[in-house]
């Protein structure tokens, strides 16, 4: 098995100008020429044979070395015999020099000759005379030189002419690789040989199309410096949807699937599912049947449940209790839960809109495992429709019409809304005077207000209440120099409103008789 060459540069492959750097510009010259097969190519020639002490440099563009460490340079050139040129015997030469310079990036157009490392002096095995010009195949010389190991990202090649009449017909730069092969369902890619002639490069294989590595047994091989692969280790196995056939993984046939690479063979599709294409890792569900994301591929496809049965309700002012029985058909699943949709409906046209976020649900609105719910904080004397839907793991996948049980009700009188604008009017050592505003929605006649208060550091473990009919009150018998939390709620025949936000008030210290304003430390909504 031959080693493969990877080209980094092939001047013959370029039809447009090479535009290498020539220094001085009057030295090497780029011209269109013909190769030995009369194919048009770009060549560089120099023939500064009349003057002594020539120093004409030609530098390639920057060559990225890729992964290579050992680089080969193949030069094809023609060199004209000095004897074929009249009157130049003292100044004409028949060799040139090859150099390289390693660098991590393109350093621009200047050739800094002192940075270049000489590879070799190149002499022609055959030069040609005036008579040889008749043959277009002008005694083409081929020389190969090796450079490396290289440590930087790329390099330049340079050719120094010292007074020869020469044409560079072809410059080829390449490195060697091991050929790509397939072994144990793993592809071992073209791999660059090592930096030393004796080195082995360990290569991890890539599984063939539709295969994956066997757990903790990665496929590996070694590429020798000669470009040959040595003994394989580890292997790949066919992915889900595929089974092994020779060096490849073939897809499962129609009506079959394979869900895991650990399965050796493909299996027939489960109930209510099918595969009408090859290479299935799972079977598609029939119309109206679905598979939840968490369902393993080997289980049957299922469908959403039917509607809950026997929906009943109970109204208590602005609170409604709903109860129902499970659906007749759970869709073939045991993960049925319930969700409630609340709509408020107008008296006239019977148009309904979603209830909004200020409605409370106990224990919750969605994901109900039990078959009951209490809906709170509804508006008084309002029409509502409640839809109770049974849901399972595939309900959200279904595009068909929702199946639900519904009930329409009218609420009674509601409790008052929250007290607002609580103010501290006066703060003493043992008493605090507060005032507040009536709720925005009394929802009836307010019979009294209830003030709840407690020492802040007690955190509501023990609290006191005080009732009053007016919108102000004085709270006495407090401890001096103590922070108290106050909350107030309104009371009507329909019940209690929500407490006002917490108000923190610090009583005056005992030592001082001076009044001061207490600072509100925190304020938050506190439910009944």
């Amino acid at each position: 098995q031959a080693a493969k060459e990877v080209l980094l540069l092939d001047s013959k492959a370029q039809q447009t100008e090479l535009e290498w750097i020539s220094s001085p510009p009057s030295g090497w010259e780029e011209i269109s020429g013909l190769d030995e097969n009369y194919t048009p190519i770009r060549t560089y020639q120099v023939c500064q044979v009349m003057e002594p002490n020539q120093n004409n440099w030609l530098r390639t563009n920057w060559i990225s070395k890729g992964n290579a460490q050992r680089i080969f340079v193949e030069l094809k050139f023609t060199l004209r015999d000095c004897n074929s040129l009249p009157g130049v015997l003292g100044t004409c030469k028949e060799t040139f020099n090859l150099y390289y310079y390693e660098t991590d990036y393109d350093t621009g157009r200047n050739i800094r000759e002192n940075l270049y490392v000489k590879i070799d002096t190149i002499a022609a095995d055959e030069s040609f005379t005036q008579g040889d010009l008749g043959e277009r195949k002008m005694k083409l010389n081929t020389e190969v030189r090796e450079i490396g190991p290289l440590s930087k990202k790329g390099f330049y090649l340079a050719f120094q002419d010292v007074g020869a009449c020469i044409a560079l017909v072809s410059v080829k730069v390449y490195y060697k690789k091991c050929w790509s092969i397939v072994e144990n369902l793993a592809v071992f890619p073209d791999t660059v040989t090592g930096s030393e002639f004796s080195s082995l490069v360990e290569v991890r294989g890539t599984c063939v199309s539709s295969a994956e590595e066997e757990a903790e047994n990665s496929p590996r091989m070694h590429c020798s410096a000669e470009g040959e692969w040595l003994v394989p280790i580890g292997k790949c196995i066919c992915k889900a949807g595929y089974q092994q056939k020779g060096d490849t993984c073939e897809p499962c046939g129609r009506r079959f699937y394979k869900s895991s690479s650990q399965d050796l063979q493909c299996s027939r599709c489960p109930t209510h599912s099918f595969s009408d294409r090859e290479g299935s890792s799972r079977c598609e569900c029939e119309d109206g049947y679905y598979r939840a994301p968490s369902d393993p591929p080997y289980v049957a496809c299922t469908r959403p449940p039917s509607a809950p049965q026997n929906l009943i309700f109970n109204i208590n002012q602005t609170t409604v209790s709903l109860e129902w029985s499970p659906p007749a058909d759970n869709g073939g699943r045991n993960d049925v839960t319930y969700r409630i949709l609340c709509k408020r409906c107008s008296w006239e046209q019977g148009e309904c809109v979603p209830c909004g976020s200020n409605i409370g649900y106990m224990p919750q609105q969605t994901g109900l495992e039990d078959n009951y719910v209490t809906v709170m904080d509804l508006l008084a004397h309002a029409n509502y429709t409640f839809e109770v839907e049974a849901v399972n793991g595939v309900s959200d996948l279904s595009r068909s019409q929702r199946l639900f049980a519904a009930v329409s009700i009218t609420t009674g009188q509601a409790a008052p809304s929250q007290v607002s604008g609580v103010m501290k009017e006066r703060v003493l050592q043992r008493s605090v005077q507060l005032s507040w505003q009536e709720p925005e929605h009394p929802n009836g006649v307010i019979t009294e207000y209830e003030i709840k208060y407690y020492e802040k550091d007690q955190r509501e473990r023990t609290y006191s209440t005080l009732k009053t009919k007016s919108t102000s009150a004085s709270i006495n018998n407090l401890k001096p120099g103590t922070v108290y939390v106050f909350q107030i709620r309104a009371v009507t025949a329909a019940g209690y409103g929500n407490y006002s936000p917490r108000l923190d008030v610090a009583t005056l210290e005992e030592a001082s008789g001076k009044m001061f304003e207490a600072t509100a430390v925190s304020s938050e909504q506190n439910p009944v």
């Epitope: 009349m50 009157g87 010009l133 002008m138």
Partner: antibody, heavy 121, light 106 residues
Framework: QVQLLQSGAEVKKPGASVKVPCKAS????????MSWVRQAPGQGLEWMGW????????TYAQGFTGRFVFSLDTSVSTAYLQISSLKAEDTAVYYC??????????????WGQGTLVTVSS | EIVLTQSPATLSVSPGERATLSCRAS??????LPWYQQKPGQAPRLLIY???TRPTGIPDRFSASGSGTDFTLTISRVEPEDFAVYYC????????FGQGTKVEIK
Amino acid sequence: QVQLLQSGAEVKKPGASVKVPCKASGYTFTSRAMSWVRQAPGQGLEWMGWINTNTGNPTYAQGFTGRFVFSLDTSVSTAYLQISSLKAEDTAVYYCARVRFTVYGDGMDVWGQGTLVTVSS
Amino acid sequence: EIVLTQSPATLSVSPGERATLSCRASQSVSSNLPWYQQKPGQAPRLLIYGASTRPTGIPDRFSASGSGTDFTLTISRVEPEDFAVYYCQQYGPSWTFGQGTKVEIK
């Protein structure tokens, strides 16, 4: 750019001498040989010979020895053609042309505009 | 001395046509045979060297071939500016020109 500049027309009497200059610019004068070519009125081109601008060594074609001399002044990048003992048949346009040697072959790649030398009594 | 014979002496062509000029050497001159173009009142211009290589700036409608004793210059589609006299030249021990071929408008 590279160019060769020759002097204007000359009218000479038979037996006289003429020195035709060819001033080079735009390149290193000593790096290319210089050739001389004659073209008689209504006739073709006739190669007279060439001079190595580095060594000063001249080469003359058959029929252009003796009365014809190629010379150089490298300090002013100029080649000269001197013709002595002029004859009527020397009436022609004289061109200097830079010689280009290449791997693939040779040629005169840059030409002066020519100097007409008329020999008439 | 090597003698170069060009033919025809005059070639009449119309613009856009192909023109083929011949140059024959009395003995082999390898491929070291350039071609020149000369227009009236102007210096010659190098068209081809080494039998088939075009210098920079010469249009690719000019091509040449041949080796040994028989050489050809071809103008693939003659343009109005191509009407001129064409000379071949050899670089033997003594450099000689052919007598020229005049390409004129038909």
